[in-house]
């Protein structure tokens, strides 16, 4: 799978994580920080 950093327009897309662009899948993906989940790392869990 080809990946690259997200475009600058997606700054802030991932609330608590790193945004990765999955080129072959034509979509952005959020790699969440520890303790966060959700498509955009918007949910905190203990």
């Amino acid at each position: 799978v080809s990946i690259t950093k997200c475009n600058s327009d997606m700054n802030g897309y991932c609330l608590h994580g790193q945004c990765i662009y999955l080129v072959d899948m034509s979509q952005n993906y959020c790699r969440c920080e520890v303790g966060y989940t959700g498509v955009r790392c918007e949910h905190f869990y203990l």
């Epitope: 690259t4 475009n7 600058s8 327009d9 997606m10 802030g12 897309y13 609330l15 662009y21 080129v23 034509s26 979509q27 952005n28 498509v39 955009r40 918007e42």
Partner: antibody, heavy 116, light 106 residues
Framework: QDQLVQSGAEVKKPGASVKVSCKAS????????IQWVRQAPGQGLEWMGR????????KYREKFEGRVTITADTSTNTAYMELSSLRSEDTAVYYC?????????WGQGTLVTVSS | DIQMTQSPSSLSASVGDRVTITCKAS??????IAWYQQKPGQAPRLLIQ???TLQPGVPSRFSGSGSGTDYTFTISSLQPEDIATYYC????????FGGGTKVEIK
């Protein structure tokens, strides 16, 4: 199956406002950005602006600033684009476009006609 | 705002010809360019994103290349069904479409 279903065609008088809706099904708009693009008859595609429904944050093209308002209601999974002070040059097909989780998935378009 | 200058605005070519369309950005767009095909009365159809990544179901005669500010879209062998208007779109910083290229058969 993911879908963006837009409201029906509108005819408006100059100076009036129009509000076009874009209802998502099959996915949660909070996971995406919703863009709005328009196309006047026989003309090219023009990006108008977008909303991040999760945060409620908007970005607009400079030429539309102050005249366009993009909103989202996450409880109904629907985005809206309102354009005010309509003029004949605003006659166009207006599209909502999903981006983020999937690159550029388009609604079917809504024709807005501005005529006196 | 980033400007996208697309050329030519129209072209006429024969079936089987190689067709090339260019888009020049006013600043580096880091390969974040997409190409759309639009036929009359239809919504635009995404052909290519991230400069050269072909979408599923798109014929391999369509291709894209470029970097920095200069990008190219190519139809290696024009087919009658390719008659349409083609648009580039930069999506690095917000979004800007090129002016479009109308492709006709000679």
């Amino acid at each position: 199956q993911d879908q963006l279903v837009q409201s029906g065609a509108e005819v408006k008088k100059p100076g009036a406002s129009v509000k076009v809706s874009c209802k998502a099904s099959g996915f949660n708009i909070k996971d995406t950005y919703i863009q709005w693009v328009r196309q006047a008859p026989g003309q090219g595609l023009e990006w108008m602006g977008r909303i991040d429904p999760l945060r409620g944050r908007t970005k607009y093209r400079e030429k539309f600033e102050g005249r366009v308002t993009i909103t989202a209601d996450t409880s109904t999974n629907t985005a809206y684009m309102e354009l005010s002070s309509l003029r004949s040059e605003d006659t166009a097909v207006y599209y909502c476009v999903r981006s983020g989780t999937l690159f550029d998935f388009w609604g079917q378009g809504t024709l807005v006609t501005v005529s006196s | 705002d980033i400007q996208m200058t697309q050329s030519p605005s129209s072209l006429s070519a024969s079936v089987g010809d190689r067709v090339t369309i260019t888009c020049k950005a006013s600043q580096d767009i880091h390969k974040y360019i997409a190409w759309y095909q639009q036929k009359p009365g239809q919504a635009p159809r995404l052909l290519i994103q991230y400069t050269s990544t072909l979408q599923p179901g798109v014929p391999s005669r369509f291709s894209g290349s470029g970097s920095g500010t200069d990008y190219t879209f190519t139809i290696s062998s024009l087919q009658p069904e390719d008659i349409a208007t083609y648009y580039c779109l930069q999506y690095d910083n917000l979004r800007t479409f090129g002016g479009g290229t109308k492709v006709e058969i000679k």
